[in-house]
């Protein structure tokens, strides 16, 4: 049994757009103790949409659902979604270190933006 | 019903160990993340070891780091802290605790007692 | 570390009236928009017991009359309206990625 899944129930979403998209992901636990992070893409060339503690991202809210019991919410929210936007996203594990490890990676939710 | 039955508690000389042990059962104990805290009168309730549902991953406070070793057997449905070195200030009521989600503490057992006296 | 707060150490109130506790952390336990704090109430001779989780999340088989709130640093645990089997001291727990995880001093609620 594995100790921590990383879960991005959508393969895709497609969003208007201006609108925001709202990208999804759940983990089966906090521990390891280390932070949960979003990109855009894979490899060396991946681009940080989002960190929990560090950084200024002004587009990006999370949105997480406390209630959820049975496990723990990294979802967040996009808003003015442009073309340029559209990708595959990526919500990814670290265990804490000097520096973080990568732990794991959910299986990427694909944005895709529709004309106005 | 979910139980969490602590044993291995008593008194031991400053210096001595002792193997604590906490016996689950109503739960999927390998699903869990498990944790030990403890109570005493004069500073409350103190964290003292959590591990991983599956035992990669064990964190201490620095109180008791390098003395005291959590581990656990899934197979058993069974939590084990092995103290060392133990201090005066290791006096206390040790509760075996369960979390879902490595978040907050679920459950709770009675807790066993551990004197450290010379 | 993240210290915890809980005021006031104790608090007499009348049956049927609100009790209303405290706990300040000196740093912010949010993450994601969640709140990492959490609170028990332990009577004499027994283990805590999880009322709420995550602020405000009131645990399965708790009563309603229990209720949590706050953000960031500052979280309220309210008992409305106050029962005797409420007589009970109360803890609140952070449970950040900040370790080590940490208990406020806690809080005996009596009756008036």
């Known amino acids: 049994e594995e100790e921590l899944q990383v879960i991005q129930p959508e393969k895709s979403v497609s969003v208007a757009a201006g609108e925001s998209a709202t990208l999804n992901c759940t983990a089966t636990s906090l521990i390891p103790v280390g932070p949960i992070q979003w990109f855009r893409g894979v490899g060396p060339g991946r681009e940080l949409i989002y960190h929990q503690k560090e950084g200024h991202f002004p587009r990006v809210t999370p949105v997480s659902d406390p209630t959820k019991r049975n496990n723990m919410d990294f979802s967040i929210r996009i808003s003015n979604i442009t073309p340029a936007d559209a990708g595959t996203y990526y919500c990814v594990k670290f265990r804490k270190g000097s520096p973080d490890v990568e732990l794991k990676s959910g299986a990427g939710t694909e944005l895709s933006v529709r004309a106005k | 019903e979910v139980q969490l039955v602590e044993s291995g508690g008593g008194l031991v000389k400053p210096g001595g160990s002792l193997r604590l042990s906490c016996a689950a059962s109503?739960?999927?104990?390998?699903?869990?993340?498990m944790s030990w805290v403890r109570q005493t009168p004069g500073k409350g309730l103190e964290w003292v070891a959590t591990i991983s549902s599956g035992g990669t991953y064990t964190y201490y406070p620095d109180s008791v780091k390098g003395r005291f070793t959590l581990s656990r057997d899934n197979a058993k449905n069974s939590l084990y802290l092995q103290m060392n070195s133990l201090r005066a200030e290791d006096t206390a009521v040790y509760y075996c605790?369960?979390?879902?989600?490595?978040?907050?503490?679920?459950?709770w057992g009675q807790g066993t007692t551990v004197t450290v006296s010379s | 570390d993240i210290v915890l707060t809980q005021s006031p150490a104790s608090l007499a109130v009348s049956l049927g009236e609100r009790a209303t506790i405290s706990c300040r952390a000196s740093e912010s336990v949010d993450l994601y928009g969640t709140s990492f704090m959490h609170w028990y109430q332990q009577k004499p001779g027994q283990p805590p017991k999880l009322l709420i989780y995550?602020?405000?999340n009131l645990e399965s088989g708790v009563p309603d009359r229990f209720s949590g709130s706050g953000s960031r640093t500052d979280f309220t645990l309210t008992i409305n309206p106050l029962q005797a089997e409420d007589v009970a001291t109360y803890y609140c727990?952070?449970?950040?990625?900040?370790?080590?995880?940490?208990f406020g001093g806690g809080t005996k609620v009596e009756i008036k």
């Open positions: 727990h952070q449970s950040s990625d900040e370790l080590p995880w940490t």
């Open positions: 995550r602020a405000s």
């Open positions: 109503g739960f999927t104990f390998s699903s869990y993340v």
């Open positions: 605790a369960s979390q879902l989600t490595g978040s907050e503490f679920d459950y």
